[in-house]
Amino acid sequence: AADPLLGGQGPAKDCEKDQFQCRNERCIPSVWRCDEDDDCLDHSDEDDCPKKTCADSDFTCDNGHCIHERWKCDGEEECPDGSDESEATCTKQVCPAEKLSCGPTSHKCVPASWRCDGEKDCEGGADEAGCATLCAPHEFQCGNRSCLAAVFVCDGDDDCGDGSDERGCADPACGPREFRCGGDGGGACIPERWVCDRQFDCEDRSDEAAELCGRPGPGATSAPAACATASQFACRSGECVHLGWRCDGDRDCKDKSDEADCPLGTCRGDEFQCGDGTCVLAIKHCNQEQDCPDGSDEAGCLQGLNECLHNNGGCSHICTDLKIGFECTCPAGFQLLDQKTCGDIDECKDPDACSQICVNYKGYFKCECYPGYEMDLLTKNCKAAAGKSPSLIFTNRHEVRRIDLVKRNYSRLIPMLKNVVALDVEVATNRIYWCDLSYRKIYSAYMDKASDPKEQEVLIDEQLHSPEGLAVDWVHKHIYWTDSGNKTISVATVDGGRRRTLFSRNLSEPRAIAVDPLRGFMYWSDWGDQAKIEKSGLNGVDRQTLVSDNIEWPNGITLDLLSQRLYWVDSKLHQLSSIDFSGGNRKTLISSTDFLSHPFGIAVFEDKVFWTDLENEAIFSANRLNGLEISILAENLNNPHDIVIFHELKQPRAPDACELSVQPNGGCEYLCLPAPQISSHSPKYTCACPDTMWLGPDMKRCYRAPQSTSTTTLASTMTRTVPATTRAPGTTVHRSTYQNHSTETPSLTAAVPSSVSVPRAPSISPSTLSPATSNHSQHYANEDSKMGSTVTAA
């Protein structure tokens, strides 16, 4: 979109070295060249730009520029050649649900959030039709429906951007020693002495008109013999500039002659350097006495001298006359690049500028929402647009309960449990998964039948010690869990039939786990001595630490897949923090011993973050961008632990690479695990075997013993060569062959070949604290004494 704030300056013959000369002789900052905005207003700054290869998610303009696909046919020309809004591109377009049609005669669609926002985004203004007046009583409503402080009306500046604040204004009378630019046309007033001084001070150049000055207009004339006033310096290139600008380090003359032949700056800090290089005391500057031989200490100090009237002081946008000198400033949305030139502020660099999508324009920005969400006009946050209202499901060790986040009704989903901490859901199938620490099992059930014990399926019931974290990969149909007793992280199919240990090394107290099936990663927290948050591919490769400093007891973690941030609570530091998926841009959102006394579980949805607190026995919520608006969702909850949001938008559909392959299950004999999508060349999946078996040379079939030909693993962390034997006759692997128990024999898999080892005997100190006490520890003693051992619990 063109910059509405530029303009109003006459063409110039030569531009400064850091400027670009437009075909129409306008000068613009060089940084605006090839930025896909028509700043010259004749497109010349966007001509001959290097052509780009646009991304798949972009629209390619006819002239080769790239813009976001969602900007196509949105009623605003983002392509310099307008091809994104052409009839050919947009004809017969049906507006998607989250967009607004610009009317029956238009082919354009604009984001629904742009309705009644004060800007006519549709060419006919359909998006602003029938909107209520929004401006406050002390404000002026512009023609484009934006609001403006009344003081800006009729001040000579187009503050509205459509000129409506300067229409119908009475012409201000010029003073007795002033000249009105443009004759009687209502132009600006300038000092009379600036008329015929061979410098254009009026926008229309009327102060130097030939008929007025009795000579040809200024152009290729030689330098004037002298300038109109003694307080000006005659540039060799013909213009006059303020004498105080001579040797001030700024090149004000077109030929830079005001900075030529300057003596080296030798004046002390308490001195003022005169134009001729001599020094006088700084207090003598502008004391209405000429102290410099050349009078430069009083140049520009004369009462009533307004430098802004001369070429706008050299400012690209707003010039403010000061008692001494002047100051260049910028309108909202712009910042000074070099004390004089305004450049756009990219508000979208602030990750919190919008709750979801931020689109930067010259001088302003707009927020948009992802598909499935719509803008809440009151809060400007993105809310779920359709479907059922979101629910919050949480465990309190003996039950799984549900709170509707909108309707706020409360129900018991699963009563009479023994010691449940971890849970997750699969929204598309309406299933819930949970771990019971006392029974040492992982269960699943349909949510509407989960209260019936007969409907509760046992998925995993062997080789489990303390499953404290659970996550469902809803795309590839797997469950992942942490076990703080075995000190492992494992994966299984959602029916529990096929299982694999992914990590058993360098884990101390693994707790929460979260998955990102769209990108193929999993994340987990470990609150051991070297507390950390780690990440790896869903197949166990590319393990890396994201957070290892300023972290003590990271309990819950959760992912915001839209903003690609990980949130966690630390119950020792009493903090709620977030990082991006690479571990960067860390933020502490909330630090509070009151609201985060002993936080455990955490979840994110829309503009809010939710967490459970064991000490407060409550569920809290806050704004996920800034940590403000903390409120109690529910209290008196008795040990609320893990917490998840149940809503279709939390688990977006995505292709299952294992099922899309030519062979079923990706050709894998046992487990097909998604690989992390690090680049476009990343494999989509790798195969894995049970803990007791080895992956063969084809990287797909499983063998009871290693093969004779050596095979190299795919693991990025370690490479290992293993002697192998042939497959024993009669040992073709069928599903029924596999046992769910694991002897933890290392097997060669594409996942983590060297990560699996014989589990150590858990050295967990039983807690002497009752879970009901307020001084919550991180370990709990197993309540079921019949089990005969202590369990690492919440």
Epitope: S389, L405, K407, R408, S411, A634
Partner: antibody, heavy 122, light 106 residues
């Protein structure tokens, strides 16, 4: 300004179906977080929550009357409806409809109709 | 169902402080609301979620409590506060009302 108004048959005979309409203005049942609830009050007695319907067409019925109640809505005409089958003299009461606000208001009834009196009598 | 118990009637002089109690048979969290009902008039929401003042309600009205015991307070009582006051919980299904407390002025 939010207003709600109930209308109904006034009098009906036992075993007949009682049909009530709530016509409202000042809000829409298309708006996220909005609901309309039905409450009744026999003369000189307390209030009883009967049913409610939400913007997403989610419905709730009081279990004690569940198989006799049907709630529905017509969002384009700003109306909500309640049907009670197999009317009984115990259904004689003043029937109210009210707006329910979800989220932080927590399911409270923040605007009420004036009520419509229904008598079930042979 | 969650039973809400209120004392049937209270008499108080204008200018005094009055507290109307509501006890729940099981925990209702903070999801307790209070209404004012006058014959021939529309019922009015006074307090939502235990202690939040509804729009347009005078600051003389206040609410407190947690778990199972909740209180509506009017301080000072004015002549037009004569009405029946109902508590209602929305935490447990089905939502239920208290029997109402009739406030009379001496």
């Amino acid at each position: 300004q939010v207003t709600l108004k109930e209308s109904g048959p006034g009098i009906l005979q036992p075993s007949q179906t009682l049909s009530l309409t709530c016509t409202f203005s000042g809000f829409s049942l298309n708006t996220y977080g909005m609901g309309v609830g039905w409450v009744r009050q026999p003369s000189g007695k307390g209030l009883e929550w009967l049913a409610n319907i939400w913007w997403d067409d989610d419905k709730f019925y009081n279990p004690s009357l569940k198989n006799r109640l049907t709630v529905s809505k017509d969002t384009s005409n700003n109306q909500a409806f309640l049907r009670i089958t197999n009317g009984d003299t115990a259904d004689t009461a003043t029937y109210f409809c009210a707006r329910i606000l979800g989220e932080d208001i927590g399911g409270a009834l923040d605007a009420w109709g004036q009520g419509t009196s229904v008598t079930v009598s042979s | 169902d969650t039973v809400l118990t209120q004392s049937p009637a209270l008499a108080v002089s204008p200018g005094e402080r009055v507290s109307i109690s509501c006890r729940a048979s099981e925990g209702v969290n903070s999801y307790m609301h209070w209404y004012q009902q006058n014959p021939g008039q529309q019922s009015k929401l006074l307090i939502y979620r235990t202690s939040n003042l509804a729009s347009g309600v005078p600051a003389r009205f206040g609410g407190s409590g947690s778990g199972t015991d909740f209180t509506l307070t009017i301080d000072p009582v004015e002549a037009d506060d004569t009405a029946t006051y109902f508590c209602q919980q929305s935490w447990n299904d089905p939502p239920t009302f208290g029997g109402g407390t009739k406030l009379e002025l001496k």
